[in-house]
């Protein structure tokens, strides 16, 4: 009776910097007692390691057991359904989980106004789970880039986009006043990682911020 249950239809990772979450879709017609077993394989150590015997959620945080992701060849994970003494076949992630699968984010964006410029500072992510030496800037040490989108409300434009190659940027507002809202999306030019837009940060610019120079 070992394989009567259907397998989870799909299993995949969704990861940000030191936030590595495994997801799966539920089996059809699961019962209240159905749970899921999770196992992990590290490339180079060709044996599966059981991580959770009975998870009743449809995701599992694997950050703690994949802390060496950024210095390894990556991982595969597998999930199977369990219901009492019955269990399904395993469903395995269909791609290797490596640093390339990590979606890049920023920690926050700080804005200030100085002499008619909007000055922005991008704070890099500092996850609590990350080992002390594994900072964003040490792991992605070269070719960090950021796409910056600014919209003005109200105004005669929806947005302006700029790609910058460092964590500071400045926009000359040229006498425009109003509320400026900024979002940032990180990337690394030498890598294929996806980036995620940050939440919008806004700042108001009024006439008082402009100084007259002769």
């Amino acid at each position: 009776h070992g394989t009567e249950l259907p397998s989870p239809p799909s299993v995949w990772f969704e990861a940000e910097f030191f936030h590595h979450i495994l997801h799966w879709t539920p089996i059809p017609n699961q019962s209240e007692s159905t749970c899921y077993e999770v196992a992990l394989l590290r490339y180079g150590i060709e044996s599966w390691n059981s991580i959770s015997n009975c998870s009743q959620t449809l995701s599992y945080d694997l950050t703690a057991v994949t802390l060496d992701l950024y210095h390894s060849n990556g991982y595969r994970a597998r999930v199977r359904a369990v219901d009492g003494s019955r269990h399904s076949n395993w469903t395995v992630t269909n791609t290797r989980f490596s640093v390339d699968e990590v979606t890049l984010t920023v920690g926050s964006v700080n804005l200030e106004i100085h002499n008619g410029f909007i000055l922005g500072k991008i704070q890099l992510p500092r996850p609590k789970m990350a080992p002390a030496n594994d900072t964003y800037e040490s792991i992605f040490s070269h070719f960090r880039e950021y796409e910056i989108a600014i919209r003005k409300v109200p105004g005669n434009f929806t947005f302006t986009h700029k790609k910058v190659k460092h964590e500071n940027f400045s926009l000359l507002t040229s006498g425009e006043v109003g509320e400026f809202c900024v979002q940032v999306k990180p990337s690394v030019a030498s890598r294929s990682n996806k980036g995620m837009w940050s939440k919008e940060e806004c700042i108001s610019l009024t006439r008082q911020y402009f100084t007259v120079t002769n």
Partner: nanobody
Framework: ELQLVESGGGLVQAGGSLRLSCANS????????VGWFRQAPGKEREFVAA????????YFGDFVEGRFSISRDSAKNTLYLEMNKLKPEDTAVYYC????????????????????WGKGTPVTVSS
């Protein structure tokens, strides 16, 4: 001196697409911000989109709503405006313009920042 000549305008049905080109037969655009403005009959000229020639900054008017994209081909010294999901209210004469400098500045949303202009290409969107 920059010499700008637009092409690619014409009649298109609502929901259709057009690609406008702006060829520069003068010296290179290299240190410029180049863009598109439009003027509908009886209305003021308005900003559509702009791009720094190095490609790292783009600007779009509020009506664009993701329907238009701006690009340039350095080898051909040509600017493009790809217009999709066109609406009757997009009917206008579209002008190519160039401004000296590539600083990231909201000045490039203003007509007065552009020193060089083409003669325009008409776009008519029928319903």
């Amino acid at each position: 001196e920059l010499q700008l000549v637009e092409s690619g305008g014409g009649l298109v049905q609502a929901g259709g697409s057009l690609r406008l080109s702006c060829a520069n037969s003068g010296r290179t655009f290299s240190s410029h911000t180049v863009g598109w403005f439009r003027q509908a009959p009886g209305k003021e000229r308005e900003f559509v989109a702009a791009i720094t020639w190095n490609g790292d900054t783009t600007y779009f008017g509020d009506f664009v709503e993701g329907r238009f994209s701006i690009s340039r081909d350095s080898a051909k010294n040509t600017l493009y405006l790809e217009m999709n999901k066109l609406k009757p209210e997009d009917t206008a004469v579209y002008y190519c313009a160039a401004a000296t400098g590539q600083v990231w500045s909201l000045q490039y949303l203003r007509e007065s920042s552009y020193a060089y202009w083409g003669k325009g290409t008409p776009v008519t969107v029928s319903s």
